[in-house]
């Protein structure tokens, strides 16, 4: 903490301007009135303060707003945003997308993923749902940031907004997030024709259940291996060799290259070797001929 001193009369601050860059830390602490700082926050970013000086300014704002900064201050934080921790941001209530844009621009090129994730979370909470304007802002200013939201927050996305989401926006989404987004995408694209539907649904398929993957195998979609590898393991394991062959079409030969990677490896172990041999790819590790497969999980479920 900055030690308290009295402000020398000649150093008294009546407005936030460039002269403050010559103030020592203790002088800033003693001479800058927090309310004045808050009122003139729009000037701060244009002044080349050192990181040490910014620490003092943050400290002043923290004292003035212990419950969290108002949006009028947040909007003009500029480089002061780089000093904020996720704990600081959690106290905020942000509704303006202009505020979000301004802070996303500042954070670019800095290691601030936790802060940005918390900021986006606060915006979604402040606006009540993840609406189209918010999604558009995220995709434009922070590709991949959509996936920083929790599944609970993503559940507030209306299906009508899904069309604004691009494949690269989903690149960092985990299975739980795709579990939430997939049914919304399915609903959003349900009236499209087969090939157009597949192009649109492809980035969301990491959340698809087995029955939907089986259905796709009947539609000559020729799924590429990159998409197949992103499917849930649980969705892939029940597929038969014939279904996988239909699903992948000409891409089926890629199974050989990926045979050591999950979910391909796990799927191979569940297939009869005879069936795998029909693919002519030299896939090994299937269940040998003459072996009986006992599904003990069924018995356990009944007992």
């Amino acid at each position: 903490d900055v030690e308290r001193t009295t402000c020398p009369p000649e150093k008294e601050v009546h407005e936030i301007d460039e002269s403050l860059i010559f103030y020592k830390k203790r002088e800033l602490e003693a001479c800058v009135d927090a309310a004045l700082l808050a009122a003139q926050m729009d000037r701060v970013d244009a002044i080349p303060f050192t990181y040490e000086q910014l620490d003092v300014l943050k400290h002043k704002l923290d004292e003035l707003y212990p419950q969290g900064y108002p949006e009028s201050v947040i909007r003009h934080l500029g480089h002061l945003f780089l000093k904020m921790s996720p704990e600081d941001i959690r106290k905020w209530n942000v509704t303006s997308l202009e505020t979000l844009k301004a802070l996303l621009k500042v954070s670019k090129g800095h290691e601030m993923s936790a802060q940005v994730a918390t900021l986006i979370d606060r915006v979604v909470v402040g606006r009540g749902q993840l609406d189209k304007d918010t999604v558009d802002t995220l995709t434009a200013f922070c590709p991949g940031c959509l996936c920083s939201l929790s599944p609970e927050r993503l559940s507030s996305v209306p299906p009508s907004v899904i069309g604004a989401v691009r494949p690269q926006d989903l690149d960092t989404c985990g299975p739980r997030q795709l579990d939430v987004l997939y049914p919304k995408a399915r609903l959003a694209f349900q009236n499209m024709s087969g090939s157009e539907y597949f192009v649109k649904i492809r980035p969301f398929l990491g959340g698809a259940p087995t029955e939907d993957v089986k259905a796709l195998s009947q539609q000559n979609v020729s799924m590429d291996l990159a998409t197949f590898m992103k499917l849930r393991r649980e969705a892939v394991l029940p597929l038969t060799v014939a279904e996988v062959q239909k699903l992948l079409g000409p891409h089926v030969e890629g199974l050989k290259v990926e045979e050591q990677h999950s979910p391909v490896r796990d799927w191979i172990l569940k297939q009869r070797q005879d069936d795998l041999d029909t693919l002519g790819l030299g896939l090994q590790g299937g269940i040998p001929n003459g072996y009986l497969i006992l599904d003990l999980s069924v018995r356990e479920a009944l007992s």
């Epitope: 690269q168 291996l225 990159a226 891409h251």
Partner: antibody, heavy 119, light 108 residues
Framework: EVQLVQSGAEVKKPGASVKVSCKAS????????MDWVRQAPGQGLEWMGD????????IYNQKFNGRVTMTEDKSTSTVYMELSSLRSEDTAVYYC????????????WGQGTTVTVSS | EIVLTQSPDFQSVTPKEKVTITCSAS???????LSWYQQKPDQSPKLLIY???NLASGVPSRFSGSGSGTDFTLTINSLEAEDAATYYC?????????FGGGTKVEIK
């Protein structure tokens, strides 16, 4: 433009570890595996293993098992290759190379990172 | 593991001449799973041919590939000065992936 940019040259002592990074840009990071290939001075190419950035799943050449670890960071589209218990024979140029999932050929290569192991 | 043996190890050729490099596998390779790379001094390797005979993007048509089973060939129809490099075959038909020992082509 598709690019793979690797970290700079390293000089290490025997027994130490080295971690090389490879930052990808210009394409969908999770649609391609990243493989690592090394080349000892005046020698040919040797495949070390690969990582699927989508799942984080790895396959290593058994020759390096226990010594090599490949990891990824989707948020920065970066993959890492760490080789431990270094010996003089590990002196080589280490390349990351992009491989479309479902194919086995490397269509884009990093510029290479020279690792020198010397006491 | 599949061992790929290239021959010759070294070839000194005059411009416009035809160059043939062979790659012999210790066991059968699915032809979809063989490729060729070109590496010039102090440069990273560059993909030339994939799936035995498909030319990679931007590769001149004087390069071609053929073969099946255990024997594969890279041909440069009319050698140019810029083709001086080391050429490697590569298989991904079985783990671990392997490369041939390389063939160095020098311009006379």
């Amino acid at each position: 433009e598709v690019q793979l940019v690797q970290s700079g040259a390293e000089v290490k002592k025997p027994g130490a570890s080295v971690k090389v990074s490879c930052k990808a840009s210009g394409y969908t990071f999770t649609d391609y595996n990243m493989d690592w290939v090394r080349q000892a001075p005046g020698q040919g190419l040797e495949w070390m293993g690969d990582i699927n950035p989508s799942t984080g799943g790895t396959i290593y050449n058994q020759k390096f098992n226990g010594r090599v670890t490949m990891t990824e960071d989707k948020s920065t589209s970066t993959v890492y290759m760490e080789l431990s218990s270094l010996r003089s024979e590990d002196t080589a140029v280490y390349y990351c190379a992009r491989r479309r999932i479902g194919t086995g050929y490397f269509d884009v290569w990093g510029q290479g990172t020279t690792v020198t192991v010397s006491s | 593991e599949i061992v790929l043996t290239q021959s010759p190890d070294f070839q000194s050729v005059t411009p416009k001449e035809k160059v043939t490099i062979t790659c012999s596998a210790s066991s059968s390779v699915i032809s979809s799973y063989l490729s060729w790379y070109q590496q010039k001094p102090d440069q990273s390797p560059k993909l030339l041919i994939y799936r035995t005979s498909n030319l990679a993007s931007g590769v001149p048509s004087r390069f071609s590939g053929s073969g099946s089973g255990t024997d594969f060939t890279l041909t440069i129809n009319s050698l140019e000065a810029e083709d001086a490099a080391t050429y490697y075959c590569h298989q991904w038909s079985s783990f671990p992936y392997t490369f041939g020992g390389g063939t160095k082509v020098e311009i006379k």
